[in-house]
Interface confidence: low
Amino acid sequence: EVEKTACPSGKKAREIDESLIFYKKWELEACVDAALLATQMDRVNAIPFTYEQLDVLKHKLDELYPQGYPESVIQHLGYLFLKMSPEDIRKWNVTSLETLKALLEVNKGHEMSPQVATLIDRFVKGRGQLDKDTLDTLTAFYPGYLCSLSPEELSSVPPSSIWAVRPQDLDTCDPRQLDVLYPKARLAFQNMNGSEYFVKIQSFLGGAPTEDLKALSQQNVSMDLATFMKLRTDAVLPLTVAEVQKLLGPHVEGLKAEERHRPVRDWILRQRQDDLDTLGLGLQG
């Protein structure tokens, strides 16, 4: 807390400008009107305040807006956002994607902080669903964002948003999350032709059921081993040797290297040895 002291004569701030960087903390508190600060937040843009001075500016805004800052102020917070606590952010009503982007930029290159997580939560709840533009923005800043959501939260992602998802966005997703995302992806990409469809659906296949894998095996897709190894074990087990051969195409030889790992190991144990021998890979059931 900064003590309440009278502003020295002639030091009352008439606008937010660079002269303020020479003010001591108590002078900022006494001489800068909070309403002026709020209306000229964008002017703070290029002023090299110290972090201690930023604390004073935050304190002034907190006093002016005890119920939470308006979006016109939030959009121009910049580095002041790094001073906010999750409790502060929970009071906000952020509806503009531009505001969200401006604040995410400030934290860019860092792990998702509790402040950012709270901000995103407030924003998404305010919108009611993870629409495409929001998802596009969030995954651009945090590629792992999608996989940090619970299956319940993912259920609010509309299929149209799936177009914004890149393969790397799904790297850390577990099977339960892919179970939710896969049907949405199938719906999103349903009008694409075979080869294009497979390119798009490939990263979601960890949520695919057996019937879909069987259908893919009829389309000369040449699935790579990395994708095959991420498939659900229960979806792979019912596939025949012929179906797996068709599904993998030239990559079928990779099964030998993966024979001790799931789902290949479990699948091998389910097959007749005669069928496995047709692959000529020396796989032992």
């Epitope: 660079e18 290029a46 090299p48 917070l77 002041l80």
Partner: nanobody
Amino acid sequence: QVRLVESGGGSVQAGGSLRLSCAASGDMNGYKCMGWFRQAPGKEREAVAGIYTGRGTTYYADSVKDRFTISQDNAKNTVYLQMNSLKPEDTAMYYCAAKYCAVVAEFGGPRLVRYWGQGTQVTVSS
């Protein structure tokens, strides 16, 4: 991806001048602050001067005020550092840096720098 390429370093006598250039390529959208840090052998990397590229507002470390001038050429996406009255203590590797400045162009710490150049050596002899 942003790439920063410095040039203009070299050796000079005390009291002399040098002009460093930093050309940025790639999507600079959002990285509003560009400028220079330096690192002398065995010392921490420190901010020298920065500029808010849209507005031309500047930041200088106390040690270089009134001697160094930072400027920009928006058309060329290039930032310049004019160094006059050079002193032996200005000897260091000078690095161009780009960092995001949404509200505060606080160029004084390297923590929030997103991109660095490879560096250009400046040597000032007495």
